[in-house]
């Protein structure tokens, strides 16, 4: 058969960043094409990317029905141009996935500070809610309706002449800390799962400070 | 497991250095955050600084700042305490400790404590 | 920097007895308040997380409780295995800040 030049896919990875999840996999293909299922551990194989020169394969639509589902994926691999050629055994080579549950593994994604307000001696500083593809009634999801009070913020805060950050957290997306008068501030948030053992940071948000037009300054 | 295990302690003369090592196994450090802690014999616990790994920020207690300093290698999975210009009263116990890094819980586990004394 | 104030320093009981151990903010720390023994020669460990939590392995004779900026620390009915220094510690804000100790003795 036409089968002796396929191979079979190998390093099978999940690339997920808040539910956006996409598999890869190699090698480029050489004569040969690709085709990707996926499927719940109870549930029926869904063929996805199907004849594929790619060596990735956006999961995302499959994986928002239940990101608290784990998922199991597989590679075919077929001959360029005799796709309905199959291996010794009578069915095309693949390899199997690592298992991926998405609300315990995606990534989290980099925040966002959206805005800080200083009145008097305390500052509130706002992270912005990212949206998700996670839908509910046809409406998506922010990442704090997808992971509630599992998610939580940490803020990192320093004085612009000094080095040291001192740290807050809120399980909402607001901070309000208490900061020196007539000192400039900069900060940094980082979205932390405390639940988790794997993949419990984001990385760390661009650093905004006062002084810039992100914040408002109020005296009272 | 988790585990920490301090290293490194030892006599030193006053206004020497030494630095200590904290090693991690069963979890990987840049997910959470390490603190150093000490105590002098016979007294409490004293917070010395925190590194999160991820990033390499610190921050010290006023006791020790500009004098110690807190750094990780994640490919070692280990922190680290530079301390220099020492003085009596940093004779201590050293701890490091795990910062579990929720609202609720802080400091979850600690390791055994490496004794450094600074006497002439 | 929040100061934890807790008492006593010290206390002699008897094995059975209920004890009882305080600590008082300067400030509002809201429930970030932990509870740590410790034994001579021996790290710190974990009791009470978040003021009134039973740390997972912890006997249920500890307790913690919080009114307003007092939190406790209770010993319902004290073994031979709980003479030890007992610390609290709030992670509100950074710095952290321990109390000073209290210290069970056996009567």
């Known amino acids: 058969s036409g089968t002796t030049n396929t191979v079979a896919a190998y390093n099978l990875t999940w690339k997920s960043t808040n539910f956006k999840t996409i598999l890869e996999w190699e090698p480029k293909p050489v004569n040969q094409v690709y085709t990707v299922q996926i499927s719940t551990k109870s549930g029926d194989w869904k063929s996805k990317c199907f004849y594929t020169t790619d060596t990735e394969c956006d999961l995302t639509d499959e994986i928002v029905k239940d990101v608290k589902q784990t998922y199991l994926a597989r590679v075919f691999s077929y001959p360029a141009g005799n796709v309905e050629s199959t291996g010794s055994a009578g069915e095309p080579l693949y390899e199997n996935s690592p298992e991926f549950t998405p609300y315990l593994e995606t990534n989290l994604g980099q925040p966002t500070i959206q805005s800080f307000e200083q009145v008097g001696t305390k500052v509130n500083v706002t992270v912005e809610d990212e949206r998700t593809l996670v839908r509910r009634n046809n409406t998506f999801l922010s990442l704090r309706d997808v992971f509630g009070k599992d998610l939580i913020y940490t803020l990192y805060y320093w004085k612009s002449s000094s080095s040291g950050k001192k740290t807050a957290k809120t399980n909402t997306n607001e901070f309000l800390i208490d900061v020196d008068k007539g000192e400039n501030y900069c900060f940094s948030v980082q979205a932390v799962i405390p639940s988790r053992t794997v993949n419990r940071k984001s990385t760390d948000s661009p650093v905004e400070c006062m002084g810039q037009e992100k914040g408002e300054f109020r005296e009272i | 497991e988790v585990q920490l295990v301090e290293s490194g302690g030892g006599l030193v003369q006053p206004g020497g250095s030494l630095r200590l090592s904290c090693a991690a196994s069963?979890?990987?450090?840049?997910?959470?955050?390490i603190h150093w802690v000490r105590q002098a014999p016979g007294k409490g616990l004293e917070w010395v600084g925190y590194?999160?790994?991820?990033?390499?920020?610190?921050y010290y207690a006023d006791s020790v700042k500009g004098r110690f300093t807190i750094s990780a290698d994640t490919s070692k999975n280990t922190a680290y305490l530079q301390m220099n210009s020492l003085r009596a009263e940093d004779t201590a116990v050293y701890y490091c400790?795990?910062?579990?890094?929720?609202?609720?819980?802080?400091?979850?586990?600690w390791g055994q404590g490496t004794l450094v004394t600074v006497s002439s | 920097d929040i100061q934890m104030t807790q008492s006593p320093s010290s206390l002699s009981a008897s094995v059975g007895d209920r004890v009882t151990i305080t600590c008082r903010a300067s400030?509002?720390?809201?429930?970030?308040v932990a509870w740590y023994q410790q034994k001579p020669g021996k790290a710190p460990k974990l009791l009470i997380y978040?003021?009134?939590f039973l740390y997972s392995g912890v006997p249920s004779r500890f307790s913690g409780s919080r009114s307003g900026t007092d939190f406790t620390l209770t010993i319902s009915s004290l073994q031979p295995e709980d003479f030890a220094t007992y610390y609290c510690?709030?992670?509100?804000?950074?710095?952290?800040?321990f109390g000073q100790g209290t210290k069970v003795e056996i009567k």
């Open positions: 400790a795990r910062d579990y890094g929720s609202l609720e819980v802080s400091l979850d586990y």
């Open positions: 069963g979890f990987t450090i840049s997910d959470y955050w």
């Open positions: 590194i999160d790994p991820q990033n390499g920020w610190t």
């Open positions: 400030q509002d720390v809201n429930t970030a």
């Open positions: 978040s003021a009134s």
């Open positions: 510690q709030q992670h509100y804000t950074t710095p952290p800040t």
